[in-house]
């Protein structure tokens, strides 16, 4: 008789999840000499230990602490790029501007990027059928808690000027419910972080509006300044040209506003 299995509203664990995590870990540690000491089997064991045999709606940050410890990594604290709802451009940017880092450029972020995972209470099985959805099921699910934990630690490590890339095409350019708005903003340390600089990325080719005047950006400014962190906002009118100018800053067309 097949055992009854909880049906969740979200997609199930990404297929070949253990193999993917292990392979990513090996690849990352080969590319990044400073992480060569990492034992990828131990990393996978710690990752698995965070959610296997646990109720997928009852995961805590504490569950991920062994993994956090193994994945401890020092990135230059003044070279951090946060993003919200514009991951691809942020990643394209750090691929060109190699001295800047998104969370997904760190080992732990790289391991979990675009993956889904969950287990089941009291069994060692991974649930490939369904996993809890943050809204419809529960917020304390393995994926959400993981990203909350690593995002908090990433923000806490930041210093000097922190940049954030925001999607100017969305109705809420700054969304208080995003990971950036609910976790990272509140974990920047005013003693270390002087300024948060927002880059608002325009979508339309003819969009010449000053999106730094958007009410949600002013809301972000208010939250940040109340935390004794200074705020700066810049429009990136032409993201394609922006990336091109990061690649070739000497290009004569790169002196004008992008």
């Amino acid at each position: 008789v097949p055992r009854w299995r909880q049906q969740w509203s979200g997609p199930g664990t990404t297929k070949r999840f253990p193999e993917t995590v292990l392979a990513r870990c090996v690849k990352y540690t080969e590319i990044h000499p400073e992480m060569r000491h990492v034992d990828c089997q131990s990393v996978w064991d710690a990752f698995k230990g965070a959610f296997i045999s646990k109720h997928p709606c009852n995961i805590t940050e504490e569950d991920y602490q062994p993994l956090m410890k193994l994945g401890t990594q020092t990135v230059p604290c003044n070279k951090i790029l946060l993003w919200s709802r514009i991951k691809d451009l942020a990643h394209q940017f750090t691929q060109v501007q190699r001295d800047m880092f998104t969370l997904e450029d760190t080992l732990l972020g790289y391991l979990a990027d675009d993956l889904t995972w969950c287990g089941e209470f009291n069994t060692s099985k991974i649930n490939y059928q369904s996993c809890p959805d943050w809204r419809k099921d529960c917020s304390n699910n393995p994926v959400s808690v993981f990203w909350k934990t690593v995002s908090r630690r990433f923000a806490e490590a930041a210093c000097d000027v922190v940049h954030v890339m925001l999607n100017g095409s969305r109705s809420k350019i700054f969304d208080k419910n995003s990971t950036f708005g609910s976790v990272e903003v509140h974990n920047l340390q005013p003693e270390k972080v002087q300024t948060l600089e927002a880059w608002v990325i325009h979508g339309g080719r003819e969009d010449s509006r000053d999106l730094c005047q958007d009410p949600t950006i002013k809301e972000l400014e208010s939250i940040i300044s109340k935390r004794n962190i200074q705020f700066s906002c810049k429009n990136i009118y032409r993201p394609d040209k922006f990336l091109q100018c990061v690649k070739n800053p000497e290009d004569s067309s790169c002196t004008s506003e992008i």
């Epitope: 000097d160 002087q194 002013k218 940040i224 300044s225 004794n228 200074q230 705020f231 700066s232």
Partner: antibody, heavy 119, light 107 residues
Framework: QVQLVESGGGVVQPGRSLRLSCAVS????????VHWVRQAPGKGLEWVAV???????DYSAAFMSRFTISKDNSKNTVYLQMNSLRAEDTAVYYC?????????????WGQGTLVTVSS | DIQMTQSPSSLSASVGDRVTITCKSS??????LAWYQQKPGKAPKLLIY???SLETGVPSRFSGSGSGTDFTLTISSLQPEDVATYYC?????????FGQGTKVEIK
């Protein structure tokens, strides 16, 4: 280029009022904050107030009850209304632009306007 | 209010000398410190922000160091055009407060 020009200074009797203006060009008041800083003759710098791009304000407690900072974005002008003036308010008053959207230090200053409070 | 104390209040040095001005805050201001230069009869000019960051266009002979409560402005090789009064300013807390100034002259 970025410029700030103060006006409205002059000789005023104690107890009277004066309104200083700071006309800005080369940047928008909807993007940057503007501070007022004063300097008594032969003395150091003293911060008075700031008005941020959204119109919110912060004051030094020493001036909060007598001075009011305001702005008119359409006229690209920031104002400092000074009431109940005293002899010790005699100073050069500078307006200055914040370097970024909302920061507490300034990169471009006006040339200053002298206010003399004397009977 | 946070008190900012500069020393010395004035100094005289020769062209080419290394000049150091110190600024102490009455409480921890982390790295929220700016340095300004004011020439006689002129408005102040921003030199350094964030305790160590050189403002664009400022000669590289100027540098800032320190964090917490003790800060230093250094002119590595004094030039005649550096004759001015130098002010530190904290921006950790309102009211913003300035040091009393250090007057730099050429011997």
């Amino acid at each position: 280029q970025v410029q700030l020009v103060e006006s409205g200074g002059g000789v005023v009797q104690p107890g009277r009022s004066l309104r200083l203006s700071c006309a800005v060009s080369g940047f928008s008041l909807t993007n940057y904050g503007v501070h007022w800083v004063r300097q008594a003759p032969g003395k150091g710098l003293e911060w008075v107030a700031v008005i941020w791009r959204g119109g919110s304000t912060d004051y030094s407690a020493a001036f909060m009850s007598r001075f009011t900072i305001s702005k008119d974005n359409s006229k690209n002008t920031v104002y400092l209304q000074m009431n109940s003036l005293r002899a010790e308010d005699t100073a050069v008053y500078y307006c200055a632009k914040t370097t970024l959207t909302r920061v507490w230090y300034v990169d471009v200053w006006g040339q200053g306007t002298l206010v003399t409070v004397s009977s | 209010d946070i008190q900012m104390t500069q020393s010395p209040s004035s100094l005289s040095a020769s062209v080419g000398d290394r000049v150091t001005i110190t600024c102490k805050s009455s409480e921890d201001i982390y790295n929220r410190l700016a340095w300004y230069q004011q020439k006689p009869g002129k408005a102040p000019k921003l030199l350094i922000y964030g305790a160590t960051s050189l403002e664009t266009g400022v000669p590289s002979r100027f540098s800032g160091s320190g964090s917490g409560t003790d800060f230093t402005l250094t002119i590595s090789s004094l030039q005649p055009e550096d004759v001015a009064t130098y002010y530190c300013q904290q921006y950790w807390n309102t009211p913003l407060t300035f040091g009393q100034g250090t007057k730099v002259e050429i011997k």
